[in-house]
């Protein structure tokens, strides 16, 4: 019970995770104007992974995509790639821990199976995880490093009178969702991978042992023992009645489908 | 058609107050940001603020700010501006103006003559 | 407070000549996220409220007629009517919408020569 328990939270949490990702990935509030000595703005100026948009007083947003490719700075790229990547492998990872959840039945699937997909996709959930929380770091450390450039060289003096303001950039909402859904899906990845060791069926294979008789010598060999874990894998002595009661183990809730001045 | 219809004339004593409305017409009302400028002696322009009539939410210049209230009724269309403490250079002539793109005020009321003698 | 500066304060212009007004403001207007710069120009003629000619320094709105244009960005930009017509006697006012609060030049009145 506590292992399925195990696996189907580690699966929830996983799930908000990555759509926490995907969220954060399709954001447009990466980084967003340092309002250091304007609270409130006439013209504020925020960036995304894929565009960038300004929002006026007026309350009209104006947004305009990176249309080039090879313009754009590496590390935006890599940020780009890291979090896709790990929502790639997140979709993975949810796919096929699916098929993996114990209170799903697929035909005649082996524990043994079950456990080594649930163990699959809590590697890849947490690879996902990190994917996204090193994405999301990378693009923090960027605004971090342009932020104090620009406020080295915040106002640069033309003619002695007139003052450029150079726009400084802070940590957008979507730093913040990326964290932690990367965390989320880091645990939920590391909840897949305990569930894994409670489902695999634990194989004790006794040494074969010799006796010496006085008389004649006779090899006693037991075969390998299945030892019976409370989450059998011997289905035979086991009835299963599609339409009646259920193991306790087997009555499980299936996961539910599912803007100034 | 746009329209911005404020209130008639106005004149107060000194330390009095005066709310001046601005009922809107001809488009969504909330869906524009409303200013309110003052001009006096017929020449100078000052912003006074902005009110988000979607939200209510409100900018004030410095120079106004403690003396201003903007407020909005959305079910009427209607911007409000007070002003409270009324001196005699608050005598002048105090227009509200619809906000569009680039933050240009599109569309002005006819304005309202707000007089504080001295 | 960004600060707004016209000249001339007053300008007498022949009908069918060009007219110029500069706007100068202490800072930039020109905003990076979308490379637009911040400036409106308005046209005041007596006992009548501003009316809106031109936004984001060189957009004109529509229904201004097209001898209104406007150019410049930064700090420093100009406003050209290109043959002066008899109804475009009036005041005209540059006023910085970027950063609050939002000022206004102190005008320029356009007189017939």
């Known amino acids: 019970m506590a292992v399925t328990a195990c696996q189907g939270l580690g699966f929830v949490v996983s799930l908000i995770g990555i759509a926490g990702i995907i969220a954060a990935t399709c954001m447009d509030q990466w980084s967003t104007q340092d309002l250091y000595n304007n609270p409130v703005t006439a013209v504020f100026n925020y960036q995304g992974l894929w565009r960038s948009c300004v929002r006026e007083s007026s309350g009209f947003t104006e947004c305009r995509g990176y249309f080039t490719l090879l313009g754009l700075p590496a590390m935006l790229q890599a940020v780009r790639a890291l979090m896709i990547v790990g929502i790639v492998l997140g979709a993975i990872g949810l796919l096929v821990s699916i098929f993996a959840l114990k209170c799903i039945r697929i035909g005649s699937m082996e524990d043994s199976a079950k456990a080594n997909m649930t163990l699959t996709s809590g590697i890849m959930f947490i690879v996902s995880g990190l994917c996204a929380i090193a994405g999301v770091s990378v693009f923090a450390n960027m605004l971090v490093t342009n932020f104090w450039m620009s406020t080295a060289n915040m106002y640069t003096g033309m003619g002695g009178m007139v003052q450029t303001v150079q726009t400084r950039y802070t940590f957008g909402a979507a730093l913040f969702v990326g964290w932690v859904a990367g965390g989320l899906t880091l645990i939920g990845g590391v909840m897949m991978c305990i569930a894994c060791r409670g489902l695999a069926p634990e194989e004790t294979n006794y040494k074969a042992v010799s006796y010496h008789a006085s008389g004649h010598s006779v090899a006693y060999k037991p075969g390998g023992f299945k030892a019976s874990t409370g989450f059998g894998s011997n289905t035979k002595n086991k009835k299963i009645y599609d339409g009646g009661a259920r193991t306790e183990d087997e009555v499980q809730s299936y996961p539910s489908k599912h803007d100034y001045v | 058609e746009v329209q911005l219809q404020q209130s008639g004339a106005e004149v107060k004593k000194p330390g009095a107050s005066v709310k001046v409305s601005c009922k809107a017409s001809?488009?969504?009302?909330?869906?524009?940001?409303m200013n309110w400028v003052k001009q006096s002696h017929g020449k100078n322009l000052e912003w006074i603020g902005l009110i988000n009539p979607y939200n209510g939410g409100t900018s004030y210049a410095q120079k106004f700010q403690g003396r201003v209230t903007m407020t909005r009724d959305k079910s009427s269309s209607t911007a409000y501006m007070e002003l409270l403490s009324l001196r005699s250079d608050d005598t002048a002539v105090y227009y509200c103006?619809?906000?569009?793109?680039?933050?240009?005020?599109?569309?002005w009321g006819a304005g309202t003559t707000v007089t504080v003698p001295s | 407070d960004i600060v707004m500066t016209q000249s001339p304060d007053s300008l007498a212009v022949s009908l069918g000549e060009r007219a110029t007004i500069n706007c100068k403001s202490s800072?930039?207007?020109?905003?990076?996220?979308?490379?637009?710069?911040?400036l409106t120009w308005y046209q005041q003629k007596p006992g009548q409220p501003p009316k809106l000619l031109i936004y984001w320094a060189s957009t004109r709105e529509s229904g201004v007629p097209d001898r209104f244009s406007g150019s410049g960005s930064g700090t420093d930009f100009t406003l050209t009517i290109s043959s002066l017509q008899a109804e475009d006697v009036a005041v005209y006012y540059c006023?910085?919408?970027?950063?609050?609060?939002?000022?206004f030049g102190a005008g320029t009145k356009l007189e017939l020569k």
């Open positions: 103006a619809r906000m569009n793109y680039g933050n240009a005020m599109d569309y």
């Open positions: 800072q930039s207007l020109l905003n990076s996220g979308n490379q637009k710069n911040y």
């Open positions: 006023q910085n919408d970027y950063s609050y609060p939002l000022t």
């Open positions: 001809g488009y969504s009302f909330t869906g524009y940001t």
